[in-house]
Amino acid sequence: MGARRLRVRSQRSRDSSVPTQCNQTECFDPLVRNCVSCELFHTPDTGHTSSLEPGTALQPQEGS
């Protein structure tokens, strides 16, 4: 409904695989087990940020 999700910064065990809910500009980093600043995908051949919408899976770039 467009409501901004609350950032949860509770400590989680190393074995926890349940992602923390993060705000719109962040994503869950399983390495540090917390929300971190997250960038939009950068297209390698142009160097420009793609128009990837939140919730859209990234697709690998094809090598020649």
Epitope: P19, C27, L31, N34, V36, S37, E39, F41, L58
Partner: antibody, heavy 125, light 107 residues
């Protein structure tokens, strides 16, 4: 332009201490996790520690746990590695690196995209 | 801790060759693998992240694939500037561990 500059390396005797600094520019360290990675002469890369400066969470390699402390000063946009009880096997070039995250369904798809030039730590009597 | 085993540890190749380096994780790391290139006296450079995503500015002759435990870095046509040491790294769980490295030398 994103840049990381390490300093503080040098020659120290076994059992001694050093504090390494990693000064960041072009981004705010509180937005990312900052990592220290080392490389002994002629050897491969070994991760040492990370910190998320926004909340101070840290983790360490078993080989340095209890001896090294990673910290960050967000006002100075700088991360630190305090190294105590140094051993000969800690001799290495120490790099700091930024972990970047790209959003993949709300989960980080990331890696260490920017690295400093490295600072040499030599532990010898 | 998750172990990352790279093979081969070194290889000799010629300019224009297709080169493949493999990395095996001791447990499932999904696609949380990065590949780096390092030249003597220099810091590592990121090539591939999340197993198959080419990092910005990296030539398209580099590609990565794999998921789970088996991963591959391929250089489709080796160039003179590609002679270096390559490392894989898993970032699925802490500690983030590196492979032992693969040195690509001139034949």
């Amino acid at each position: 332009e994103v840049q990381l500059v390490e300093s503080g390396g040098g020659l120290v005797q076994p059992g001694g201490s050093l504090r390494l600094s990693c000064a960041a520019s072009g981004f705010t360290i509180s937005s990312n996790s900052i990592h220290w990675v080392r490389q002994a002469p002629g050897k491969g890369l070994e991760w040492v520690a990370w910190i998320t400066p926004s909340d101070g969470n840290t983790d360490y390699a078993d080989s340095v746990k209890g001896r090294f402390t990673i910290s960050a000063d967000t006002s100075k946009n700088t991360a630190y590695l305090q190294m105590n009880s140094l051993r000969a096997e800690d001799t290495a070039v120490y790099y700091c690196a930024r972990r970047v995250c790209y959003n993949n369904l709300g989960v980080c798809a990331g890696a260490m995209d920017y690295w400093g030039q490295g600072t040499l730590v030599t532990v010898s009597s | 801790d998750i172990q990352m085993t790279q093979s081969p540890s070194s290889l000799s190749a010629s300019v224009g060759d297709r080169v493949t380096i493999t990395c095996r994780a001791s447990q499932d790391v999904s696609t949380a693998v990065a590949w780096y290139q390092q030249k003597p006296g220099k810091a590592p450079k990121l090539l591939i992240y999340s197993a198959s995503f080419l990092y910005s500015g990296v030539p398209s002759r580099f590609s990565g694939s794999g998921s789970g435990t088996d991963f591959t870095l391929t250089i489709s046509s080796l160039q003179p500037e590609d002679f270096a040491t390559y490392y894989c790294q898993q970032t699925s769980t802490s500690p983030p561990t590196f492979g032992q490295g693969t040195k690509v030398e001139i034949k």
